[in-house]
Every structure is written in structure tokens, then in C-alpha cells.
């Protein structure tokens, strides 16, 4: 079970964009191409934007999330990809408090991104009220913002 | 697009046992509930409990407990449900629904056009 | 369990007309600052269809006409303009405790 106090709230997201630093045995299932990277991660995008833009909209006051603790960009020379697995129990657990069919459509994608083998960690909601609210805000805002410093390395490197 | 597919009509006798599948098509199966419900002749539905595929665990309705048995076949994507100990108060339509992704339950926003089971001596 | 009590249990009504139908919750089905509250339509021979999930979120594919509202334990479906189509028994039902319970149906 992760804890969503402090720095641990994003531990999961710190291999959103990693798959390069990982050991082979978590190497996806089927490896995507660059060009199927972007497609996904153009779909993505606006999904991602709607969903922030929404909930940013609907929850006047939340403090902006601390973007630091994402590292996106691996300093290997190879591409990075995101890791489906890492963000999808995120959007499963946040699904039942935002708009389910863009949640639906997010975890779709995101699925085309998993790793093999590699176990889901389960996210429970914050059960205070504010946290709850930042941690969704946080996961959204993190989440775009992985998106665009991905799709920036796809589209700066070799086509 | 997202579909659910039941098998067919059964007719079975009073203390037998009915296996009826539910095979998911259109979205990705693992992270997804799948409920079965019942609704009686001229009835309200009524849940009978749910399975989650990607751990196979399952959450059933006391009412059924002891007779019902969920599991899934993530190979195949399809969800069997197995009653036992079948009474005539059991003919109903027996019907499959995709519910929600987490521990949170959600609306059940897919169905599977059911199945008819019919207990009769 | 929750025990929902959806009012009134069959109505008459003509196409244009504004239609309310209630569902009361014995015990209240918020949960997270959300209301799990969701209600189906079921026409004769075919499955129920997601109408409204959480009690007010109209879902995909569904016409306007259809809107939902409430809180706590009290809740209304109402279709604004209604169309020959709309006839169906409708049903409320809430997600927020097992067992999932569902209302008699209007």
C-alpha cells in the first residue's frame, strides 16, 4: 500500500518515463516504436489537459503541485517511454472521483504502456478531505506534465 | 468498442448447478469489476456480487453466499459464474456488468443482454 | 444493507411533459464529497443502460433531456422534455456500501 504523505506520494510516478534505466526482465511486453510512443502520447495529451483543466476549474484554492519530484527524462541516450504500469493504479484509483469516460479512455493508453511482469502497487485515496483533493490535483497535474517532457524527447530526437 | 457477451438460455432441475460466462471484449478486462445480477420474472434486480480479474478477488452478496462462485480467465477475458443447489426461485435473467476500477465501487455502465436460466422439474 | 425506496412506482405521462421520479436511501451514500448514486433505464427484453452515475453525471451517449440531482439520501431523475422512447421502468441504485442495492424500479 503506498502512503500519500510527503515525498512517498509520487514514488510511483518517479518511473513514469524511465523504461531505459530498468532491468530487462521489466521490459515491455511488446517494445513500441518512437513513432507509436508519440501516437499514444498524443492522445494522451489532451485527455490529460481536459481532466486537469476540469478538476482546476471545480476545485478553486488548491495549491499548484510540486512538478520536482517527476524526473521524466532519463539520461540514457535511448528514448524514454512512460510506464504504463507505474501510472495506471493512479487513474484506477482516481477514476471513481473524476470523469470516468476520460478515465477510461487514459487507462486504455496507459495499458499499451505496461511493463511485463511488473507488479501493480495499490493506491487507496486520502481520506481526509483536502489531501484527498490534492492528491488527485497532484496526480494530474504530475501526469501532464510527464506527457510534455515526453513528448519534448520524442519529438527532439530521431524520428 | 466495449461489449460483454453471455452465453446462452439454460434450463436446469431443482439441486443441480448452472455455469453461465460473460466474455469482455473492447477494453482492457484486467482493471475492471465485473457484477452479476439477477432479475426474476417481472422483478427488480437484485446484485449477487463481483469479481475483480486482474487479482480474482470477489465480494458476494450474503444472500448467495455458500452457492455462488465467481472466477475469471484473464487468458481468454471471460468471467464464469457458477450457482449451486438450484431452486425454482432462481429462474431469472442472469446478467454481467462492467462496475468500477478500485476499491471505491462505481456505476455498472456495460452489460451483457443476459441470460435466462429456467429451474423447473 | 441500503434499502432504496424509488417514488412513484409506475407514472403516466405524455411526450413534452417534465418527469420527476425520486429515491430515497435509507442511510446516506456519500462517500469522498461524492454521491454514489446511479440510475438505469430497462426496456421490456433488454439489459439495463447507464443513464446517470454519481448522481448527477450524465452518462456517454445519453440525451440531454435526461439529468440527475440530490445528496446524501435524496435524490431525483428528471427528463425535461419527454419522448415515446422514454417509456422503460427506471431504476436507482447506490455503489457506495455492499451489498449493491437497487430500488424497486418506476
Known amino acids: 500500500m503506498l502512503s500519500h504523505a510527503g515525498p512517498a506520494r509520487f514514488a510511483l510516478f518517479l518511473l513514469c518515463c524511465m523504461e531505459t534505466l530498468l532491468p530487462s526482465h521489466m521490459a515491455p511486453t511488446h517494445r513500441l516504436q518512437p513513432s507509436d510512443v508519440r501516437k499514444i502520447i498524443l492522445e494522451l495529451r489532451p485527455m490529460s489537459k481536459g481532466l486537469l483543466q476540469d478538476y482546476v476549474s471545480k476545485e478553486i484554492g488548491l495549491p499548484e503541485s510540486n512538478h520536482s519530484s517527476l524526473p521524466c527524462l532519463s539520461s540514457d541516450s535511448q528514448l524514454p517511454h512512460i510506464n504504463g504500469s507505474a501510472i495506471l493504479p493512479y487513474f484506477r484509483a482516481i477514476r471513481p472521483l473524476s470523469d470516468k469516460n476520460t478515465i477510461d479512455k487514459i487507462i486504455e493508453q496507459l495499458d499499451k504502456l505496461k511493463f511485463q511482469r511488473e507488479p501493480e502497487a495499490e493506491v487507496s485515496m486520502p481520506a481526509d478531505n483536502f489531501e484527498r483533493k490534492n492528491f488527485i490535483l497532484a496526480v494530474l497535474q504530475q501526469f501532464s506534465a510527464c506527457l510534455e517532457h515526453v513528448l519534448q524527447s520524442l519529438n527532439s530526437g530521431p524520428q | 468498442q466495449v461489449l460483454l457477451v453471455q452465453s446462452g438460455a439454460e434450463v436446469k432441475k431443482p439441486g443441480a448447478s448452472v455455469k453461465i460466462f460473460c466474455k469482455a471484449s473492447?477494453?482492457?478486462?484486467?482493471?475492471?469489476?465485473i457484477n452479476w445480477l439477477r432479475q426474476a420474472p417481472e422483478q427488480g434486480l437484485e446484485w449477487m456480487g463481483w469479481?475483480?480479474?486482474?487479482?480474482?478477488?470477489?465480494k458476494y452478496n450474503e444472500t448467495f453466499k455458500g452457492r455462488l462462485t465467481l472466477t475469471a480467465d484473464t487468458s481468454t477475458n471471460t468471467v464464469y459464474m457458477e450457482l449451486s443447489s438450484l431452486r425454482s426461485a432462481d429462474t431469472a435473467m442472469y446478467y454481467c456488468?462492467?462496475?468500477?476500477?478500485?476499491?471505491?465501487?462505481?456505476?455498472?455502465?456495460?452489460w451483457g443482454q443476459g441470460a435466462l436460466v429456467t429451474v423447473s422439474s | 444493507e441500503i434499502q432504496m425506496t424509488q417514488s412513484p412506482s409506475s407514472l403516466s405521462a405524455s411526450p413534452g411533459d417534465r418527469v420527476t421520479i425520486t429515491c430515497r436511501a435509507s442511510?446516506?451514500?456519500?462517500?469522498?464529497?461524492?454521491?454514489?448514486m446511479h440510475w438505469y433505464q430497462q426496456k421490456p427484453g433488454q439489459p439495463p443502460k447507464l443513464l446517470i452515475y454519481?448522481?448527477?453525471n450524465l452518462e456517454s451517449g445519453v440525451p440531454s433531456r435526461f439529468s440527475g440531482s440530490g445528496s446524501g439520501t435524496d435524490f431525483t431523475l428528471t427528463i425535461s422534455s419527454l419522448e415515446p422512447e422514454d417509456a422503460a421502468t427506471y431504476y436507482c441504485?447506490?455503489?457506495?456500501?455492499?451489498?449493491?442495492?437497487f430500488g424497486q424500479g418506476t
Open positions: 456488468a462492467r462496475g468500477g476500477t478500485s476499491v471505491i465501487r462505481d456505476a455498472m455502465d456495460y
Open positions: 442511510e446516506s451514500v456519500d462517500n469522498y464529497g461524492i454521491s454514489f
Open positions: 473492447g477494453y482492457s478486462f484486467t482493471y475492471y469489476d
Open positions: 469479481i475483480f480479474p486482474g487479482d480474482g478477488g470477489t
Open positions: 441504485q447506490q455503489s457506495n456500501k455492499d451489498p449493491l442495492t
Open positions: 454519481r448522481a448527477s
